[in-house]
Amino acid sequence: ELCDDDPPKITHATFKAVAYKEGTMLNCECKRGFRRIKSGSPYMLCTGNSSHSSWDNQCQCTSSAARNTTKQVTPQPEEQKERKTTEMQSQMQLADQVSLPGHCREPPPWENEATERIYHFVVGQTVYYQCVQGYRALHRGPAESVCKMTHGKTRWTQPQLICTGETEPSQFPGEEEPQASPDGLPESETSR
């Protein structure tokens, strides 16, 4: 079941998923001047069985000016390595050895993809928030939102996070840190 809405927006924060639940869709969008190849899928889909999950379909972009081209534009590993922009790196930020049953990792970048990735999440997905440059969190442990089904409708839980300018004093000067197990997965991920 797809979540009806996007995860909540938190002022001065960004969110990312650690892994994507099966059923998640990622739009195949291209940057300006490029378009999806004619035979290409409009999205990638996280699918799998009990032991392995992966993204079905491959996003491919081609120049809007080029006609009747079937040129393969998925970059080779060496090309991918050379095209490490900050934008690409940030998209790959969570794509390491996190391995969750029934989940896909962050898909690698494709050539000429749009600057922003648009995901369509499914019920049970958790996303995590982090304050952006120049802001710090008043709640300083992991901040998360989960897509839940309630009374036949989907909703995202509200992350307990406020990001404040670094120069502003914290409202919670004596706040204790909740200690997380560094080697295990976040509780919300293991309990699923």
């Epitope: 050895q97 982090q130 304050c131 969190a137 560094p182």
Partner: nanobody, 127 residues
């Protein structure tokens, strides 16, 4: 458990550049905030730069802003510190550290909040 190993230190003339690397072993590297700190003889360990797990937050100490750049490559489990326009006052042992709270919602500059530390690499800037 996360193990961190720094490399890339050395002797360089003022105005020169160095690139420090910190290789991490252990699971889920990309879910940790990572930081660089330095300690000169007889001084306290001080914050240099850090990078959030989300890539959205890279604070720097005022003394290195515009000269140092922190970056990370999660495919290689490595954090880098590119140091340009080095000054004699940058001379210190540089340490890489990993925050103990995974997916922490901000990036801390406080050494005590980093539980995993490397052994350090010496940087000497001569005038």
């Amino acid at each position: 458990e996360v193990q961190l190993v720094e490399s890339g230190g050395g002797l360089v003339q003022a105005g020169g550049s160095l690139r420090l690397s910190c290789a991490a072993s252990g699971r889920a590297f990309s879910m940790y905030n990572m930081g660089w700190f330095r300690q000169a003889p007889g001084k306290e360990r001080e914050f240099v730069a850090a990078t959030g797990w989300s890539g959205a937050n890279t604070p720097y100490a005022d003394s290195v802003k515009g000269r140092f750049t922190i970056s990370r490559d999660n495919t290689q489990n490595t954090v880098y510190l590119q140091m340009n326009s080095l000054k004699p006052e940058d001379t210190a042992t540089y340490y890489c550290a990993a925050d103990s709270i995974r997916l922490r919602s901000d990036v801390t500059r406080i050494p005590l909040e980093y539980d995993y530390w490397g052994q350090g690499t010496q940087v000497t800037v001569s005038s």
